[in-house]
Interface confidence: low
């Protein structure tokens, strides 16, 4: 028997520095977790203690903090090289700055293979990107070889900016021939490493003949056997065992997100490459694990540029950006409108001639807007200003909801109106009218939404049975501020870009902004 230790991360989302327990900015070091310096300590400890170790990443290193905003992926290549990753799969967010934003900072600089079997380049891009990412890679480990095949969510064109010269194929269809090829090369230990979410990971384990282990990402799935060490609730045991169609037991793993845990899976293979046993658990990277001093010193060196960036002007406002709770928790506020407009703008994807865009709607809890911005400071808007408005380090995500769920959400928005509570919704691509004289749960008297399947966008009444795409904060997607109906009834959830980054990019693009209060939210006569 031959034993392999797989260490794995996924959805790190630019958390290079240690973070608080909820993966936001670290305030108190004795409570902070993760970060590449701490990760390196643990990885090195395991490399010293165990003979056959692979360190793998399942995608979405890009996007999530000011590190990515400033360094645009160069930081990912630099620190993943320093940690000596063995392989990485491409995630959807690796395309956030277009193909160029992937090729130059990461693909050309990485000293480890970057993989995806289901992304095919065409046209002029094919020769430019050739060899920079691979469908699979055979890695020598001790006296053996291990094959790694990569895969990426086929939804990436809707979630990021891969352009028109990359085709995202069905994962299972694309993986099978690559695995077959590895078998003909006498590689009998094969790991599928990819970024399509836990449901697809399980399908790959079930359907792709010859895959021994699946290491996934995208759905931020936390798996754990026994008592979980922090506040994440396990979606199942670690590893999650899937019985393949040809009768094999295939371990599937994921390690939550944000570098908070290091996935740790021990696999025992027989001489024919069959999995005899698999066990392990994610390791919580808490402050009992010291940060490696040399990586930490390097982080501090790279940090200097971030501090300078946060005070530079992104753009100007010529109007007061009203982010006060007195406005945003009671009525339409222009800060809410600005943020929602930025959220929609960030999700412009012309993927189908029938649609002007795949999504037109935004909702945003008023309680998530934490500060106004005064235009009388020469109109200057900085990252620092935006961090005061959106201090929680969240993301703006894409969900699919039925009209009936949206209606419930808007009823919840005003169910206890007048108490300055955070659930009052700011909107984009939506016109809502409330009648506060009616009883809670029956206060939405008009709800019109902007069409997507149209060449000239217009507002149509919400249809209860129709499925709509909506951009919203991850806080709401997870049921925050009492929006349990969103969490319980959503049909799909894809995590998006860092909230501040979305707004800062929009302001930089627009250069001068002047959002107005324009009648998106109205109260019917006599009640307000």
């Amino acid at each position: 028997a031959w034993e392999l230790t797989i260490l794995h991360t996924n959805d790190v989302h630019s958390r290079l520095e240690q973070t608080s327990e909820d993966s936001s900015k670290c305030v108190n070091a004795s409570r902070c977790m993760g970060g590449v310096a701490r990760l390196f300590t643990k990885v090195q400890q395991i490399r010293r203690a165990e003979p056959n170790v692979l360190l793998l990443d399942a995608g979405d290193q890009y996007q999530g903090t000011i590190w990515f905003t400033v360094y645009k992926g160069a930081e990912v290549a630099h620190f993943m090289n320093a940690l000596r990753y063995d392989a990485m799969a491409l995630g959807n967010h690796e395309f956030d700055n277009g193909v160029e934003g992937l090729i130059e900072p990461l693909l050309k600089e990485a000293k480890f293979p970057i993989l995806s079997a289901n992304i095919k380049a065409k046209g002029p891009l094919a020769s430019q990107i050739s060899g920079l990412y691979l469908p699979y890679k055979v890695l020598p480990v001790g006296d053996e070889v291990v094959g790694i095949v990569g895969y990426t969510s086929k939804e990436t064109p809707f979630l990021s900016n891969p352009g028109t010269n990359l085709v995202f194929e069905d994962e299972i269809t694309a993986l099978q021939p690559e695995v077959d090829k590895l078998k003909t090369l006498n590689v009998n230990k094969i790991i599928a490493l990819g970024h399509s979410g836990f449901e697809m990971d399980k399908l790959i384990a079930q359907k792709v003949r010859g895959v021994d282990v699946v290491v996934g990402g995208h759905s931020n799935t936390f798996l754990y056997t026994g008592n979980p060490p922090s506040k994440e609730v396990p979606a199942g045991k670690y590893p999650f065992i899937v019985t393949s169609d040809d009768g094999r037991k295939v371990p599937v793993v994921q390690a939550y997100a944000f570098g908070k845990y290091l996935g740790y899976l021990k696999i025992e293979f027989d001489e024919r490459g069959n999995v005899i046993s698999s066990h392990g658990n994610p390791i919580l990277l808490n402050s009992s694990i010291p940060e490696d001093p040399s990586i930490k010193a390097d982080i501090n060196k790279w940090r200097i540029k971030l501090d300078n960036y946060s005070t530079q002007e992104l753009g100007k406002t010529i109007v007061y950006l009203d982010g006060s709770s007195q406005s945003c928790r009671f009525r339409e506020c222009n800060m809410g409108n600005l943020i929602c407009d930025a959220m929609i703008n960030n999700n412009l994807r012309h993927t189908d001639e029938m649609f002007w865009n795949h999504v037109s709607m935004c909702i945003l809890n008023g309680g998530g807007i934490r500060s106004p911005i005064d235009e009388r400071n020469n109109g200057t808007i900085t990252w620092e200003n935006l961090a005061a408005v959106l201090p929680f380090g969240g993301t703006f995500d894409l969900v699919q909801l039925k009209g009936s769920t949206l209606k419930k959400a808007f009823e919840h928005s005003v169910h206890r109106y007048g108490q300055s509570t955070g659930e009052f919704l700011q909107v984009g691509g939506i016109h809502v009218v409330y009648d506060l004289s009616r009883k809670p749960g029956d206060r939405v008297v008009k709800l019109d939404v902007l069409c997507t399947k149209c060449r000239v966008p217009s507002y149509d009444p919400l249809k209860m049975d129709e499925v709509y795409k909506v951009i919203l904060p991850n806080f709401l997607a997870n049921g925050g501020d009492g929006f349990q109906m969103i969490k319980d009834e959503l049909l799909r959830h894809d995590s998006g870009d860092q909230d501040i980054n979305v707004v800062s990019t929009y302001i930089s693009k627009m250069k001068v902004i002047y959002p107005a209060v324009e009648g998106r939210i109205k109260f019917s006569t006599g009640s307000h």
Partner: antibody, heavy 118, light 107 residues
């Protein structure tokens, strides 16, 4: 006002176990972590560990791992520290201390004296 | 573990005198430092946290300062009830560690 109330002195035999309660009042129990500290006679203080009453998550000083188990009972707003396999080395006063938003200890229990003797 | 070296280990001072006790950490602790006062047979009482923030109800004659590895507690004008043992604690990394204590006695 914020108070941490601990039980009275314990005289226990070597090899036995003891479970010390620390009942919190005057604040929302789940808002603050609880730390435990050991003080042997005439000595300085030693940090034992910390428990988060929200999820029962614990962090222990390596030195006390296997010796100590920290638990909570949310319904009674009580934190507990169990000491196992007691020896004379465990003779000391044990304190619970609430930690504030900054994770700094702010309010202390009055201490429970544990004497291990046959 | 981080070592906390407190000095002096004991000292004598007169009423009304200005008293300073220092604490040195073996590495940078990012101002995550508390000071406690303990009287014989009593539990410790927290005076200061985050290096310089006074706990509610603690007299203003107590103050804390410092950053990085070096911290100090100052009593601007010593009063009789200030006699006791003073401890520092770092809570920047686990395990949290206390200084060895400074015994303050009346001259």
């Amino acid at each position: 006002q914020v108070q941490m109330k601990q039980s009275g002195p314990e005289l226990v035999k070597p090899g036995a176990s003891v479970k010390i309660p620390c009942k919190a009042s005057g604040y929302t129990f789940t808002d603050c972590n609880m730390d435990w500290v050991k003080q042997s006679h005439g000595e300085s203080l030693e940090w034992i560990g910390d428990i988060n009453p929200n999820n029962g998550g614990t962090i222990y000083n390596q030195k006390f791992k296997g010796k100590v188990t920290l638990t909570i009972d949310k319904s009674s707003s009580t934190a507990y520290m169990e000491l196992r396999s007691l020896t004379s080395e465990d003779t000391a006063v044990y304190y619970c201390a609430r930690t504030n938003w900054d994770y700094a200890m702010d309010y202390w229990g009055q201490g429970t004296s544990v004497t291990v003797s046959s | 573990d981080i070592q906390m070296t407190q000095s002096p280990s004991s000292m004598y001072a007169s009423l009304g005198e200005r008293v300073t006790i220092t604490c040195k950490a073996s590495q940078d602790i990012n101002s995550n430092l508390s000071w406690f006062q303990q009287k014989p047979g009593k539990s410790p009482k927290t005076l200061i946290y985050r290096a310089n923030r006074l706990i509610d109800g603690v007299p203003s004659r107590f103050s804390g300062s410092g950053s990085g590895q070096d911290y100090s507690l100052t009593i601007s004008s010593l009063e009789y009830e200030d006699m006791g043992i003073y401890y520092c604690l770092q809570y920047d990394v686990f395990p949290r560690t206390f200084g060895g204590g400074t015994k303050l006695e009346l001259k």
